[in-house]
Interface confidence: low
């Protein structure tokens, strides 16, 4: 359909309220350091001038692109240069290539404090002004993190408001309130590095990429829906996710409500665990569909040999449709194998590709390809003697331990990278065993799998902005499939050279003794990532003492009557005490 | 707001040593890109180092490589810059500035900084 008015017709698709909560977002991925009430004041102005072209789709400016409108925006802000600095020559910039400037200036580390939760605090906000607090919720989540799923964040901001309804009525307000705001936090920041990763994806690799990643994906989930039903949902899905990891959030919503409204109406053919989903309001229904339980699968599945190796005519299936026959396959295999990590059936498709591009051109193709199955045990014994290993290894140690040995490793193999990433990063990795290691056999290849290339996004995601290591830069841009391997197979970096020990790394103060634990764990894990700097070749045992003076040092100086005191005098002694130990 | 104030400036002979400092209030610093400038007089501010927010990355001006090292403290809040080997050519007011939003020093244009200190005063003579 053309429309004389993009933004009237969005605007009338998607409702007042949705409308302003995305434009909210747009503007706060952006402008992530502006004020909640400098972009209440934008959302007013688009949302009166979107209400004009409602009314008048031949009124002034009603014709321009989005793009256009948000743009100028976003450049008729006096301050722009004062705060966002060199964002502000993308002003100099035309339509689409200014789009594609902001773009590239979205920060995925921004430079926010951490939201601390006060449950009276919040109550009286909430009870004060609903709508306020709503969109104020949007925007602190959309500024941390730009590439938010837009309509995924509009769910998340109504059971929000919906948590804050119950508890604000308590009498234990923060009893009932923490625990329900740290699961949603839990959910919401696995949220974000899923899109995250899905925009990396199509940003870096390309929209075939993501189609393959969503295609393996979506055959495991809904086994029963014939290959051009996934194939369909897989297009839309795919223009989608691209329209909102390009900031075009109102489009994004409104297509993804379109794409809900299909699979709801074709349910039939696609799962029978839609049902529920089906029946819940469009915010609900999206999300239960994204989320929704694995169908089961058909009885009577073909073994996929009979059409990927003994079949006469691969080669020609191959060489006339080479994207479709390689996606029959990926679709075959994956609905297969609900067990199997997306990144290892992309493996797997990758493989039998390979070999089909070389058999194909031998003069007895058949007897080439015949064992092609068989190259497909190694791709899958490699994670699942890794998961086998750690999951035991996180037994052993329990999660904090685990997360140190996780340090440990990826220090030697990366020295070069930032403390605070190499921190960030192990701490995500090591959380692969209390999510994974407990479930069942068959879905912890998948759970730990697909969770590792998140939190390696997210390394490759902070990497790319600061490039420091070669090695990094090569897993992250070779292979999206393949970076969990090609980390899992990287070796202590011998040609690092140790970094000076500088004392203040290892000073602290009494702070720490009112930090809670996680915090307190992460200053530990610093200062053990700073000593690996140092000393790469440390010992296990050596910095096991290290870690266990230090405990000793701190739990001494938090029960003294002056902690201050107590770390100006024993912490010289402790860095002496290190300075001996890895001597 | 964010609040910059340097210290630790003075007279110094050639071939001296001197380490300057530059406490932050209204914001952590090291969750933000700050650099040092300078300014000889009749002359624009000129880049001497920076380090990235939560990402432990140095950048410096050639014509300092090998004699200044920039480093912060940050339960303190404070960044330094520890001066050796100076030279008369090293004399100029010594100002730190922040981007805030800005986690790594992606410049070293003293116009895309906001905030600023007062400055201190650096005189390389004998």
């Known amino acids: 359909d053309t429309y004389k008015s993009e933004i009237a017709h969005r605007f009338k698709d998607l409702g007042e309220q949705y409308f302003k909560g995305l434009v909210l977002i747009a503007f706060s991925q952006h402008l992530q350091q502006c004020p909640y009430e400098e972009h209440v004041k934008l959302v007013r102005e688009v949302t009166e001038f979107a209400k004009t072209c409602v009314a008048d789709e031949s009124a002034e400016n009603c014709d321009k692109s989005i793009h256009t409108l948000f743009g100028d925006k976003l450049c008729a802000i006096p301050s722009l240069r004062e705060h966002y600095g060199d964002l502000a020559d993308c002003c100099e910039k035309e339509e689409p290539e200014r789009n594609e400037c902001f773009l590239q200036h979205k920060n995925d580390n921004p430079d926010i404090p951490k939201l601390k939760p006060d449950p009276v605090a919040l109550c009286a906000d909430f009870q004060e002004d609903e709508q306020k607090f709503w969109g104020k919720y949007l925007y602190e989540i959309a500024r941390r993190h730009p590439y938010f799923y837009a309509p995924e964040l509009l769910y998340y901001a109504i059971i929000y408001k919906d948590v804050f309804s119950e508890c604000c009525q308590a009498a234990d307000k923060a009893a009932c309130l923490l625990p329900k705001i740290e699961h949603l936090r839990e959910k919401v920041l696995t949220s974000a590095a899923k899109q995250r990763l899905k925009c990396a994806s199509i940003q870096k690799f390309g929209e075939r990429a993501f189609k393959a990643w969503s295609l393996a994906r979506l055959s495991q989930r809904f086994p029963k829906a014939d290959f051009t039903e996934i194939s369909k949902i897989v297009t839309d899905l795919a223009k989608v996710h691209k329209e909102c990891c390009h900031g075009d959030l109102l489009e994004c919503a409104d297509d993804r409500a379109d794409l809900a409204k299909y699979i709801c109406e074709n349910q039939d053919t696609i799962s029978t665990k839609l049902k529920e989903c089906c029946d819940k309001p469009l915010l609900e229904k999206s999300h239960c569909i994204a989320e929704a339980k694995r169908d089961e699968l058909p009885a009577d599945l073909n073994p996929l040999e009979h059409d990927f190796v003994e079949d006469k005519e691969v080669c020609k299936n191959y060489k006339e449709a080479k994207h479709v026959f390689l996606g029959t396959f990926l679709y075959e295999y994956s609905r297969r194998h609900p067990d199997y990590s997306v990144s290892l059936l992309l493996r797997i498709a990758k493989i039998y590709e390979a070999t089909l591009e070389d058999c194909c051109a031998k003069e007895d193709p058949p007897a080439c390809y015949a064992t092609v199955f068989d190259k497909f045990q190694p791709l899958v014994d490699e994670p699942k003697n890794l998961i086998k290993q750690n999951c035991e290894l996180f037994e052993k140690l329990g999660e904090y331990g685990f997360q140190n040995a996780l340090i440990v490793r990826y220090t030697k193999k990366v020295p070069q990278v930032s403390t605070p990433t190499l921190v960030e990063v192990a701490r995500k990795l090591g959380l692969v065993g209390s999510r994974c290691c407990k479930r069942p056999e068959e879905e912890r290849l998948s759970c730990a799998e697909d969770y590792l290339s998140l939190v390696l996004n997210r390394l490759c995601v902070l990497h790319e902005k600061t490039p420091v290591s070669e090695k990094v830069t090569k897993c992250c841009t070779e292979s999206l499939v393949n970076r969990r391997p090609c980390f899992s197979a990287l070796t202590p970096d011998e040609t690092y050279k140790p970094k000076e020990f500088v004392e203040g790394t290892f000073t602290f103060h009494a702070d720490l003794c009112t930090l809670p634990e996680d915090e307190k764990q992460i200053k530990k894990q610093t200062a053990l990532v700073e000593l690996l700097k140092h000393k790469p070749h440390a010992t296990e045992e050596q910095l096991r003492t290290v870690l266990g003076n230090f405990a000793a040092f701190v739990q001494k100086c938090c029960a003294a009557p002056d902690h201050e005191a107590c770390f100006a005098v024993e912490g010289p002694k402790f860095v002496i005490e290190i300075r001996g130990i890895l001597a | 707001e964010v609040q910059l104030l340097e210290s630790g400036g003075g007279l110094v002979q050639p071939g001296g040593s001197l380490r300057l400092s530059c406490a932050a209030s209204?914001?952590?610093?090291?969750?933000?890109?700050v650099a040092w400038f300078r300014q000889a007089p009749g002359k624009g501010r000129e880049f001497v180092a920076g380090?990235?927010?939560?990402?432990?990355?140095?950048y410096y001006a050639d014509s300092v490589k090998g004699r200044f090292t920039i480093s912060r403290d940050n339960s303190k809040n404070t960044l330094y810059l520890q001066m050796n080997s100076l030279r008369p050519e090293d004399t100029a007011v010594y100002y730190c500035?922040?981007?805030?939003?800005?986690?790594?020093?992606?410049?070293?244009?003293?116009?895309?900084?906001?905030?600023w200190g007062q400055g201190t005063l650096v005189t390389v003579s004998s």
């Open positions: 380090i990235g927010g939560g990402v432990d990355i140095t």
């Open positions: 209204g914001r952590y610093i090291d969750e933000t890109a």
């Open positions: 500035g922040t981007r805030p939003g800005r986690p790594l020093i992606t410049s070293k244009v003293a116009d895309l900084y906001p905030y």
